[in-house]
């Protein structure tokens, strides 16, 4: 027999199939040109000393073979003695070590058996009613196909599935979608209606994330407020990476989980923009305000679960950075200015009424005045900070007020509103004899003492009514008692107390008269 022809004789070996697990498999035969054909197969097992024979039986019952030696691929023409227009049955017999192993048979019409291509190019992936939908352009001149898919997870082996018949310029497949694990898919095609024809190669991997992106396991901490009024938000724990199937472990697109940070600045609600979204890798600097920080995970199917963290406001206060002057027209605040064209946000809230919303005011962009100060004024009619109570004031600054991450804290302090001079006057001043020439003066704490850092000192004034001589005694703001000594018996005195702030002298309390009785010896 000639090597280019199918030999219509008995093959040169015994015909028994050993039935072993090794041997030839996955035989596929197809037309490769107008008159050329190709068959190829896989061989499982040791290849040394193996000879392969491609067997063919015609519809008439006559059979022939091609001897291919150790090759697992054979090309032949339509002149090789094999009928290409009628149905034939083909299989491979592999002979080795006096044993013959046989592949499964394929029955087909060779002329109609075209080598189909797998889905090529861009395979679009979407979610449809809890399932995965894949869609691709049908390869040129190959409309009419049967399509199969195989899929695996990081912990499972390949499972085969059927996409059903396709008959259009675009083909699609519905596949199972896993809730919590990534999957790798591959697709293959063959000619529709030719059961014996061969499958295409498997497509490139299609990597699909789980339906639910993983919960972002992160932890935040925040550094101390720096001298620039900003503090760094830091990530203490990175999000866990998704486990991927074998074919998706390179730079395979499609399975990525992206994490984003959504910042919400809770303080200063009158500013232009309260929220900002940025990538998780870009950890921002924050002002001393309170923030909510959400970590949002998303994949190709959209957003997944998120985590929300709360960053409390930095409560560190500077006692004297703010100067407040009250005039007949209204009140003006002064503080050390930032750069040119800075917008300030001034926020205040009554202390002890934290349940109420803070009052917020935004200034127009302003430059420092000649003394290097920034200012904010309001009229008496506005009623702002008009009540005689303690207010917590915070001032924020930004040269770019629409950029949430560029705000900084200028100062955080306390202020006693209204007529602090009168409201702060100490009450319940009482005088008790202490010794023959001294008395103890006590008073109730000033309302100013409820306002941290506002009360600078008490001053106790004692006037000798005989000589009109006056002495003043400064007292620490934490004390509400002083001893007056070197007093003379039988002389009338008056005592008054006032409470002073750093920028305001208080009003004297009502005069309290007393005298030390003259001791009469028996």
């Amino acid at each position: 027999c000639r090597t280019s022809e199918c030999c219509f004789q008995d093959p040169p070996y015994s015909d028994a199939d050993s039935g072993s697990a090794s041997g030839p498999r996955d035989l596929s035969c197809y037309r490769i040109s107008s008159a050329g054909y190709e068959c190829s197969w896989q061989y499982e097992g040791p290849t040394a000393g193996v000879s392969h024979f491609l067997r063919c039986c015609l519809s008439s019952g006559r059979c022939c073979y091609f001897a291919t030696g150790s090759a697992t691929r054979l090309q032949f023409s339509d002149q090789a003695g094999v009928s290409v227009l009628h149905t034939v049955t083909l299989w491979v017999e592999s002979w080795a070590r006096n044993r013959t192993e046989k592949s499964p048979e394929v029955t087909l019409q060779l002329y109609k058996s075209v080598k189909y291509k797998p889905p090529l190019g861009d395979i679009k992936v979407s979610k449809l009613a809890g399932q995965l939908r894949m869609e691709w352009e049908t390869p040129d001149n190959q409309v009419g196909a049967e399509v199969q898919f195989r899929h695996r997870t990081p912990s499972s082996s390949w499972k085969l599935g059927d996409c059903g018949p396709q008959d259009d310029d675009t083909e699609s497949c519905l596949c199972p979608l896993e809730m919590n694990v990534a999957q790798e898919f591959q697709l293959r095609r063959r000619r529709l209606g030719s059961q014996g024809s061969s499958w295409s190669k498997w497509s490139s991997p299609v990597c699909v994330p789980p339906e639910n992106p993983p919960q972002p396991q992160v932890r935040f901490s925040v550094e101390q407020l720096g001298r620039d009024g900003r503090r760094r938000l830091t990530l203490k724990e990175q999000p866990t990476q998704l486990e991927l199937p074998e074919g998706c472990q390179g730079p395979a697109p499609g399975v990525e989980v992206t994490y984003q940070l959504q910042l919400h600045m809770l303080s200063c609600p009158c500013k232009a923009k309260a929220t900002r979204t940025l990538p998780l890798e870009k950890m921002p600097y924050l002002s001393g305000a309170a923030y909510n920080v959400a970590v949002i995970s998303s994949n190709r199917f959209g957003p997944g679960p998120n985590q929300t963290w709360h960053i409390p406001a930095d409560t560190h206060t500077e006692p004297v950075a703010l100067n407040i002057s009250v005039g007949t027209n209204g009140t003006t605040m002064y503080w050390p200015a930032r750069a040119q064209s800075t917008t300030y946000c001034i926020e205040w809230q009554p202390v002890g009424q934290e349940g109420s919303l803070a009052t917020c005011n935004l200034t127009a962009p302003q430059d420092p005045d000649p003394a290097g100060m920034a200012t904010y004024s309001w009229s008496r009619e506005s009623g702002a900070m008009g009540q005689e109570k303690c207010y917590h004031i915070t001032i924020f600054a930004s040269a770019h007020p629409k950029k949430l991450t560029l705000w900084s804290t200028v100062l955080s302090t306390y202020h006693f509103g209204g007529n602090a001079s009168a409201a702060g006057t100490p009450h319940h001043v009482s005088v008790k004899n202490h010794s023959l020439d001294s008395v103890s003066v006590d008073w109730a704490p000033s309302l100013l003492s409820t306002c941290p850092g506002v009360l600078k000192e008490y001053v106790v004034r004692c006037r000798d009514e005989d000589s009109n001589q006056v002495s003043e005694h400064p007292v620490q703001p934490t004390e509400t008692q002083v001893t007056l000594s070197d007093l003379r018996a039988g002389v009338a005195y008056t005592v008054q107390v006032r409470a002073d702030t750093a920028w305001l002298r208080g009003a004297w309390s009502q005069p309290q008269r007393f005298s030390i009785k003259v001791q009469v010896s028996d």
Epitope: F220, S221, L266, A290, Q307, T308, H310, E354, G355, L357
Partner: nanobody, 126 residues
């Protein structure tokens, strides 16, 4: 110590409304924030709403946003959860939780909170 007592749970028809309350007593001056969580039979505990005691800023998950509203009355030391357009999947035991102190914490995690109530049961029938 802080004690939290929930009330106001009950049976309601789908589409209906209910308001549950949580009264706090004890060292309530230390309260920084309050939250509601819920647990349906056989499911994990789920975050429902969060409110800052100062200023009243609120946070909700997507599942209840627009239907539920958390509010508080500082004078009464009480936090409320107003639930509208109720669905059968809202059926659960609702717990309130209190946060003391001013550290960074996760709003939607049960473990972030310092004190918890015993819960009040809400059943939504279809």
């Amino acid at each position: 110590e802080v004690q939290l007592v929930e009330s106001g749970g009950g049976l309601v028809q789908a589409g209906g409304s209910l308001r549950v309350a949580c009264a706090a007593s004890g060292r309530t001056f230390s309260t920084y924030a309050m939250a509601w969580f819920r647990q349906a039979p056989g499911k994990e505990r789920e975050f429902v709403a969060h409110i800052l005691w100062s200023g009243g800023s609120t946070v909700y998950p997507d599942s209840v946003r627009g239907r539920f509203t958390i509010s508080r009355d500082n004078a009464k030391n009480t936090v409320y959860l107003q639930m509208n357009s109720l669905k059968p999947e809202d059926t659960a035991v609702y717990y309130c939780a209190q946060k003391s102190g001013r550290q960074v914490y996760r709003i939607d995690s049960w473990d972030s909170f310092d004190y918890w109530g015993q819960g009040t049961s809400v059943t939504v029938s279809s």
